[in-house]
Amino acid sequence: SGRGEAETRECIYYNANWELERTNQSGLERCEGEQDKRLHCYASWRNSSGTIELVKKGCWLDDFNCYDRQECVATEENPQVYFCCCEGNFCNERFTHLPEAGGPEVTYEPPPTAPTLLT
């Protein structure tokens, strides 16, 4: 059961592997899912010695771990790929790493672009 969740209809889209997977590289994604299932946005990235390499962004289907999260915040210490998810339109535009071990909070701001709409 849920109450007052932010409805997710659109997310920021990005795919670093867009050429190989034959998709758009970036834009907006309209989320579609089953009835009575919640929708989320997500972001995934790598951190190579402080250099952020965005992997993917987009819609994420019903996942309890994302329920009631208004911001996209990754908390795991040092995974191969950082992952965060959230609820609310375009909530994955900005994403943050807030490590448990008390390291600095790092927020990644998107560069100003004019995104295209994916259909």
């Epitope: 059961s1 771990n65 329920y67 009631d68 990754a74 908390t75 992952f83 448990e100």
Partner: antibody
Framework: VQLVESGGGLVQPGGSLRLSCSAS????????MHWVRQAPGKGLEYVSA????????YYADSVKGRFTISRDNSKNTLYLQMNSLRAEDTAVYYC?????????????WGQGTMITVSS | DIQMTQSPSSVSASVGDRVTITCRAS??????LAWYQQKPGKAPKLLIY???NLQSGVPSRFSGSGSGTDFTLTINSLQPEDFATYFC?????????FGPGTKVEIK
């Protein structure tokens, strides 16, 4: 990083108990939390979940309407209120933390607390 | 509900052996699968998440593979501390469900 359950014991059929799970060493309010049980000599059975801010909950059919999951993020504590207990609820009850990345796995478990329902 | 099955239910092996445990989901779960180790009287311990990702602090002799409905946990060069029961768990949809377990015993 640990979870410590308490509140287990012997209770008569139809009785009530409240289990507590005290968390330390991680940002409790950032994670969905879960209860899983294991009957003596049996496998693991999923019981209940609560989202990071307590706004969403889930119950397995076997406990729906009898058990209530809740949390107090200011006290870093997870609860399971168990009413109308039955013999088949006899089990070790574990609280577990969701792994913060992708996959909906449980990376931290409590030591478990035993509930025996018997007359 | 998604049903999880495991095979074998038990396996006898010696230190140094390679042990393979399989887990099958009743419907596709993509890579939403975790593996746990449990010893008597103890809580389960996460070994593998998202089908093939090794949890921090878990020895590299453990590995996972698979996607969809069929998954495998492999223990290369079994060590004395690896004798335990192993469970798979799907995290694709509620209720999250566990396999019945595979007991790895000393031959």
């Amino acid at each position: 990083v640990q979870l410590v359950e308490s509140g287990g014991g012997l209770v008569q059929p139809g009785g009530s108990l409240r289990l507590s799970c005290s968390a330390s060493g991680f940002t409790f309010s950032s994670y969905a939390m879960h209860w899983v049980r294991q009957a003596p000599g049996k496998g693991l059975e999923y019981v209940s979940a609560i989202s990071s801010n307590g706004g969403s909950t889930y119950y397995a059919d076997s406990v729906k309407g009898r058990f209530t999951i809740s949390r107090d993020n200011s006290k870093n504590t997870l609860y399971l209120q168990m009413n109308s207990l039955r013999a088949e609820d006899t089990a070790v009850y574990y609280c577990a933390k969701t792994y913060g990345g992708y996959g909906n796995a449980f990376d931290i478990w409590g030591q478990g607390t035993m509930i025996t329902v018997s007359s | 509900d998604i049903q999880m099955t495991q095979s074998p239910s038990s396996v006898s092996a010696s230190v140094g052996d390679r042990v393979t445990i399989t887990c099958r989901a009743s419907q596709g779960i993509s890579r939403w699968l975790a593996w746990y180790q449990q010893k008597p009287g103890k809580a389960p311990k996460l070994l593998i998440y998202a089908a093939s990702n090794l949890q921090s602090g878990v020895p590299s002799r453990f590995s996972g593979s698979g996607s969809g409905t069929d998954f495998t946990l492999t223990i290369n060069s079994l060590q004395p501390e690896d004798f335990a029961t192993y469970f798979c768990q799907q995290g694709k949809s509620f209720p999250y469900t566990f396999g019945p377990g595979t007991k790895v015993e000393i031959k």
